[in-house]
Interface confidence: medium
Amino acid sequence: MMTGTIETTGNISAKKGGSVILQCHLSSTMAQVTQVNWEQHDHSLLAIRNAELGWHIYPAFKDRVAPGPGLGLTLQSLTMNDTGEYFCTYHTYPDGTYRGRIFLEVLESSVAEHSARFQIP
C-alpha cells in the first residue's frame, strides 16, 4: 500500500538568466528510495539520482543543470523556453512510484522573485 506523499516547491517563478532550485520531498513512508528521475515538460529526462550510482545529468542539459541540493535539481542560465512543468519521479521499494509536479515560470522582468514554498500537489 502506498502511504507516502510527495511535497514539491509547487508553482515557482525565476528571472531569465538566473537559476532556480527544483525540490521534491517524499514523506509519510518508510519505503527505500532507489532512484529519483527529473523530467521536463516534454518528457525528456534532465537527470537521474540513483541511490547506488549517484547523479547522472543527461548530456543535453550538462551545462545548465547542477545536481542537488539533496535529491533536488538546480537549473541555471534560465531561458524563456524553460517555462513549463517539471516532474520528479521517486522509484521506491516496496511502495512503487511516486510523482510530483512543479510549474516553473521564467520571467523577463528584473523584479521577478524566486518563490519556493513547499506544497502537496
Partner: antibody, heavy 121, light 108 residues
C-alpha cells in the same frame, strides 16, 4: 584507440570463485564507468553490474547481488569482476564494456573481447 | 525492471534486401533511451545505435533506428554479407539495464 583487454579463459569447480580482469587503454581511465555483461552459450546478453570511475560507486543487477564484486585498480587501469559461489549456470562468456559517457549513461560503447568461464565438476 | 521483447527471433533474407527488426518494451522508455548492438559469432557485441536513432561512430548509414515509447525499430536498408549477425536492443532509461532476447539475421 580505446581498447579493453580481458584475462584468459577459466575453468572452475562449483562453489569456487573466479576473478576476471579487464585492462583499459587509449582513454582517461578515471573518467568512465565500466559495465560487466555476460552471455551463456547460445543465449542473450545479461547485464551484471557497473562500477564508477573512482571505484566508490557500484550497482549490481539484483540477480547477482551478494555474489558479484566489481573493483578497479587505477594504477594499472584495470577493472576486476569477481563472481563467487559458482554453479554450472554461471558458465558463460563475461564481457567488460566501457560506458559511452563520462556520466553513467548505460550505453556500452567499447567492449572487451570476452572471457570464457566454465564451471564444471 | 523493463523487459524488452524482440521480433522476429530469426529473419531469413538475401544480400541486398531490407531488414526490419522490432523491439518492444514492457513500459515506456522515456526520451528514447534505447540502443542497438550487433554481434557476430565468436565476437563481442558492437554498438550500432543509441538514443533510438543516433548512429555510433563508424557505423554505415544503411543502419537506421527509429521509434519511441515502447516500440522501436532497427532497419538495415540493403543487407551486406557482413551484416548477417545477431542484433540486440537494450534500454538505458534506468538501471538495471536490460537487453532484448536478440534477432538473428541469417542468409536465405
Amino acid at each position: 584507440q580505446v581498447q579493453l583487454v580481458q584475462s584468459g579463459a577459466e575453468v572452475k569447480k562449483p562453489g569456487a570463485s573466479v576473478k576476471v580482469s579487464c585492462k583499459a587503454s587509449g582513454y582517461t581511465f578515471t573518467s568512465y564507468y565500466m559495465h560487466w555483461v555476460r552471455q551463456a552459450p547460445g543465449q542473450g546478453l545479461e547485464w551484471m553490474g557497473v562500477i564508477g570511475p573512482s571505484g566508490a560507486s557500484t550497482s549490481y543487477a539484483q540477480k547477482f547481488q551478494g555474489r558479484v564484486t566489481l573493483t578497479r585498480d587505477t594504477s594499472t587501469s584495470t577493472v576486476y569482476m569477481e563472481l563467487s559461489s559458482l554453479r554450472s549456470e554461471d558458465t558463460a562468456v563475461y564481457y567488460c564494456a566501457r560506458d559511452h559517457s563520462d556520466y553513467w549513461s548505460g550505453i556500452m560503447e567499447v567492449w572487451g573481447q570476452g572471457t570464457m568461464v566454465t564451471v564444471s565438476s | 525492471e523493463i523487459v524488452l521483447t524482440q521480433s522476429p527471433g530469426t529473419l531469413s533474407l538475401s544480400p541486398g534486401e531490407r531488414a526490419t527488426l522490432s523491439c518492444r518494451a514492457s513500459q515506456s522508455v522515456r526520451s528514447s533511451y534505447l540502443a542497438w548492438y550487433q554481434q557476430k559469432p565468436g565476437q563481442a557485441p558492437r554498438l550500432l545505435i543509441y538514443g533510438a536513432s543516433s548512429r555510433a561512430t563508424g557505423i554505415p548509414d544503411r543502419f537506421s533506428g527509429s521509434g519511441s515509447g515502447t516500440d522501436f525499430t532497427l532497419t538495415i536498408s540493403r543487407l551486406e554479407p557482413e551484416d548477417f549477425a545477431v542484433y540486440y536492443c537494450q534500454q538505458y532509461f534506468s538501471p538495471p539495464w536490460t537487453f532484448g532476447g536478440g534477432t538473428k539475421v541469417e542468409i536465405k
